[in-house]
Interface confidence: low
Amino acid sequence: CKAMHVAQPAVVLASSRGIASFVCEYASPGKATEVRVTVLRQADSQVTEVCAATYMMGNELTFLDDSICTGTSSGNQVNLTIQGLRAMDTGLYICKVELMYPPPYYLGIGNGTQIYVIDPEPCPDSDF
């Protein structure tokens, strides 16, 4: 396994609708054909997998149908969007990139993007 540099923004604020987007960029040391991207969430020293997708370079990322993630790729950049976030989902979201094919296998893990999610204030009752 060879190491690879992965860059991602330090902080992202989710929208009022609970959507957060960030770019995960990797320094490919060769001509990868197949890439796997995994988003991990670290909170309270626990790391859990949020979503993962394997894609051919130049193709759309295909996450599972019930995934909260969507994404697109452009060269060595992956644009990731996580939906359905609530305040309790605030945490460090780490981008993990693996160059799956052809060999050699490369692995890169970003430093993480701190995503802050603020639940919207409920609308006050109105007679109108």
Partner: antibody, heavy 124, light 113 residues
């Protein structure tokens, strides 16, 4: 012996479909990406598409997009090519070919093992 | 997409001759110091056979009379001393990623003079 053997060729009506198979032996099939390449009579080589080793991700040449499907069954060491809406210009010998990879120092590439090819004739 | 142009499209040569085939790419095929260009030999009625990969590396079992050179956009396949079994058609091929595309040159037919 490392080999690929194509089958399923023959005469197909215009507008019809073909499904070709490529049986692999002598190597660990699930470790390699495999390609389909075709060659019209008296013409050059034309790349159709690639399927990756384990996930089965695919990519196709622009001219075949929407008309071709490549799939694989690693448990059967077999690769498949489905080509739809056939026309006369799809008449060709269809080859499957293994993607070379070697060592840990770089992304060496090339098609190092080829099948013998299977002839598909599209005619009414 | 990158286009590959081979020259000549055909040539006549004798056994023992030194033969050179060129392949020109419409833009550089180099990436991280590697030229992603391969050469194949094809005989009538047979599947292509890999000769050279990464512009200059001989594939397993290929005789030393075959050599590849070049970088960037200009590449050469040389057969130092043509043998009877070398009369065939030769193709260059380039690989690019994002998305993966594999492009072949139009071929060069080497015939007996």
């Amino acid at each position: 012996e490392v080999q690929l053997v194509e089958s399923g060729g023959g005469l197909v009506q215009p507008g019809g479909s073909l499904r070709l198979s490529c049986a692999a032996s002598g190597f660990t099939f699930s470790d390699y990406a495999i390609h389909w390449v075709r060659q019209a009579p008296g013409k050059g080589l034309e790349w159709i598409g690639i399927i990756s080793p384990s996930s089965g991700s695919t990519n196709y040449a622009q001219k075949f997009q929407g008309r071709v499907t490549i799939s694989r069954d690693n448990s059967k060491n077999t690769l498949y090519l489905q080509l739809n809406s056939l026309r006369a210009e799809d008449t060709a010998v269809y080859y499957c070919a293994r993607d070379i990879h070697s060592g840990s120092s770089g992304y060496y590439y090339g098609f190092d093992v080829w099948g013998q090819g299977t002839l598909v004739t599209v005619s009414s | 997409d990158i286009q590959l142009t081979q020259s000549p499209s055909s040539l006549s040569a004798s056994v023992g001759d030194r033969v050179t085939i060129t392949c020109r790419a419409s833009e550089s095929v180099d990436f991280f110091g590697i030229s992603f260009l391969a050469w194949y030999q094809q005989k009538p009625g047979k599947a292509p056979k890999l000769l050279i990969y990464d512009a200059s590396n001989r594939a397993t079992g290929i005789p030393s009379r075959f050599s590849g050179s070049g970088s960037g956009t200009d590449f050469t396949l040389t057969i130092s001393s043509l043998q009877p079994e070398d009369f065939a058609t030769y193709y260059c091929q380039h690989y690019t990623s994002s998305p993966p595309v594999y492009t072949f040159g139009q071929g060069t037919k080497v015939e007996i003079k």
